[in-house]
Interface confidence: low
């Protein structure tokens, strides 16, 4: 099936020594209305100012050519975890995932996911308890009133809990995911397992019989070859943002999720670069409509797993790992131990069938070009709530293939890309260095026009 | 040098109808979203519609269901087609091009001269 | 009843500062859109005089600068000259509208 992401993040808790100060208590129902738009609109904002921060990070220590992981997924473990935080422990949090929302950020989230996606989107939360630890019923209900997240005992055994949690993790993926932990630490007193399962449809799905062999740009001088599914007149909605300069592109799901892909033109780029002006709104311009698009996207499969730990302390975190104030959870001190996150993705050509209208009219007008054959960026966002659910960074989509010196012609300007470009303009420096966007003029790119 | 030229104004009766056009030129018209703006004599600017690059539209709340904005590409040519004309729908009509910026939102950059609707029996 | 707040009148020397205000809500200048100003003559169409809360395109004197703060902003002129009397509006993309909203206006007089 076409479109498939399953995120994991694991938050294991354990001993910590004594000490601390007293505990602030939140009045209760405090937290207990629905969000208003304001609110869901400030979350999704925060939540991508979250995502750029974590991924960035994330990125600058990683090796691997390609990345994926959900922000969302880490959000909830950390709310999950400000359910009983307190004091300073708290603030951290809410600063980190860029949340002024006081004590109801968990119950934000999680009301806010309890709507997503309905039919692509399984939302799954598990807490492991050390046999006999006294964790507090305040937030044993709250944990699964919020998120489900029904209190299991390990027996001590270690064996048998490892068996027990990837067979949950297993199921709760539905297989995407096999064998999430390979060790428990003997001091494990507290485990926050939050699996996310996604399976998405293109709303315009791909022609299988067009899917063909073709070049994928590493860089200037090397390519390898891809699977790379085609459309000749794709409803997408594209724009340009300059400085640095990127083209981004919406393919919508089905339920209401979009996909979407940010190709800078050049080779000379990083995660921590490109993010470092994106925001929710920079993605997300109004009266930037579908127009019918000659598309070029590879498919794919990725995987990767992380311990996050690193990098949720460069994020100002690192309390949780040393002395955070969680008496909220116990009484008796609790430090976080690890912090695992694993997605998979896959996309491949299946959806649902576009109407033989929508074509026909769409094919009246104007037709630009938009290939995914270079190194790429790309964002699944749910568009009623704006929440980014994932962030993805890809260099090269066929590590285990051959890479394949280009041709002399080929290099360096990559003509079937430039094809791709046109009708965007370059070189209009109106607006100093900020990350902007802009229409597409065709007096910029004439020999690119597009055919009226 | 960008352009926007409106026409089509006049009087008109209340329940009339009445349809403006505004010829766009010095830019690739089809890249750009537009927006029709009005201004009532002696008050503030209100914005009426917007056109997106592929056609999508968003309405005022005091126009939806009686106004039609539509975009002719080939012509260059934005246009709004009132129906059930008011007397409060008396106004100077701008045509206004809409502009990215650095935030990623936009701004009305170029406007028109306007042309006047006068609705009055 | 305009959607965004701003003074209807206001009034200076020349050579004198000026500042005219703006106010929003969370579903429009408070939901991070950015403001834009328009001046408009007498008699003549709306101009662009700064857009994205502080930016001038070109051609704008230095003398006009705007700045964004919560759910408000505002247009400072300096310097003030008799060629700035006209009316000033204030607009912002408005989410729960899905659309434009302006100010009412305000009218420079340059005494």
């Known amino acids: 099936n076409q479109e498939q992401v399953s995120p994991l993040t694991l938050l294991k808790l354990g001993n910590q020594e004594p000490g601390g100060q007293t505990a602030l208590k939140s009045p209760p129902g405090v937290c207990s209305r629905d969000p208003t738009p304001e609110q869901t609109h400030r979350l999704a904002r925060a939540m991508m100012a979250f995502t750029a921060d974590l991924f960035s990070l994330v990125a600058q220590t990683s090796t691997c050519p390609n990345l994926i992981l959900s922000p969302l997924s880490v959000a909830l473990a950390l709310s999950h975890l400000a359910l009983g935080a307190q004091n300073h422990t708290l603030q951290r949090l809410q600063q980190v995932l860029h949340a002024g929302s006081g004590p109801c950020l968990p119950h934000l989230l999680s009301r806010l996911c309890q709507d997503l996606g309905p039919g692509a989107f399984r939302l799954a939360a598990r807490m492991y308890l050390q046999k006999g630890f006294p964790i507090k019923e305040d937030f044993l209900e709250q944990s699964e009133q919020l998120f489900g997240a029904k209190p299991v005992s390990l027996t001590g055994k270690q064996e048998d809990d490892l068996a027990n949690i990837n067979q949950w993790v297993k199921e709760a993926t539905e297989g995407k995911i096999q064998e999430f932990l390979s060790g428990l630490p003997e001091d494990t007193v507290l485990l926050l397992l939050n699996a996310i399962h996604f399976q998405g449809f293109w709303r315009n799905k791909f022609d299988p019989s067009l899917t063909q062999r073709d070049s994928f740009h590493l860089d200037e001088q090397f390519t390898v070859p891809v699977e790379m599914m085609q459309a000749r007149t794709y409803p997408l909605r594209w724009f340009l943002l300059e400085q640095p300069e990127i083209q981004v592109a919406h393919f919508p799901f089905k339920n209401n999720m979009s996909f979407v892909v940010l190709v800078p033109t050049h080779f000379e780029w990083n995660v921590s670069q490109v993010l470092a002006n994106l925001s929710w709104d920079t993605l997300h311009p109004p009266l930037v409509w579908e127009r019918p698009t000659k598309v070029r996207l590879p498919k794919l499969y990725l995987k990767h797993q992380m311990d996050l730990v690193a990098t949720l302390s460069q994020l100002g975190l690192q309390e949780l790992f040393q002395a955070p104030d969680l008496r909220g959870i116990s009484e008796q001190s609790l430090v976080v131990s690890g912090v695992q996150h694993q997605s998979t993705l896959e996309l491949s050509e299946v959806g649902v069938e576009a109407a033989a209208a929508t074509s026909i009219a769409m094919s009246r007008m104007s037709l630009s070009s938009f290939s995914v054959n270079r190194p790429f960026l790309f964002f699944i966002f749910e568009d009623t709530t704006g929440l980014p659910l994932f962030v993805g960074s890809v260099r090269n989509p066929n590590p285990s293939a051959p890479r394949e010196l280009k041709e002399q012609q080929d290099s360096p300007g990559n003509k079937d890309f430039l094809q791709s470009l046109k009708g965007f303009p370059r070189g209009d420096k109106l607006f100093g260095p900020d990350l902007k966007l802009v229409p597409p003029m065709e007096e910029d790119y004439p020999q690119f026009g597009s055919p009226k | 040098e960008v352009q926007l030229l409106e026409s089509g104004g006049g009087l008109v009766q209340p329940g009339g109808s009445l349809r403006l056009s505004c010829a766009a030129s010095?830019?690739?018209?089809?890249?750009?979203?537009m927006s029709w703006v009005r201004q009532a004599p002696g008050k503030g600017l209100e914005w009426v519609s917007a056109?997106?690059?592929?056609?999508?539209?968003y309405y005022a709340d005091s126009v939806k269901g009686r106004f039609t904005i539509s975009r002719d590409n080939s012509k260059n040519t934005l246009y709004l087609q009132m129906n059930s004309l008011r007397a409060e729908d008396t106004a100077v009509y701008y045509c206004?091009?809409?502009?990215?910026?650095?935030?990623?939102?936009?701004?009305?950059?170029?406007w028109g001269q306007g042309t006047l609707v006068t609705v009055s029996s | 009843q305009s959607v965004l707040t701003q003074p209807p009148s206001a009034s200076g020397t020349p050579g004198q500062r000026v500042t005219i205000s703006c106010t929003g809500s969370?579903?429009?200048?408070?939901?991070?859109?950015?403001v834009h100003w328009y001046q408009q003559l007498p008699g003549t169409a709306p101009k662009l005089l700064i857009y994205?809360?502080?930016q001038r395109p070109s051609g704008v004197p230095d003398r006009f600068s705007g700045s964004k703060s919560g759910t408000s902003a505002s247009l400072a002129i300096s310097g003030l000259r008799s060629e700035d009397e006209a009316d000033y509006y204030c607009?912002?993309?408005?989410?729960?509208?899905?659309?434009?909203?302006f100010g009412g206006g305000t009218k420079l007089t340059v005494l």
């Open positions: 969370s579903s429009n200048i408070g939901a991070t859109y950015d």
């Open positions: 056109i997106g690059t592929g056609g999508g539209t």
């Open positions: 607009a912002a993309w408005d989410d729960s509208l899905s659309g434009w909203v």
């Open positions: 010095g830019f690739t018209f089809d890249d750009y979203a």
């Open positions: 206004a091009r809409e502009y990215y910026d650095s935030s990623g939102y936009y701004h009305l950059d170029y």
């Open positions: 994205s809360n502080n």
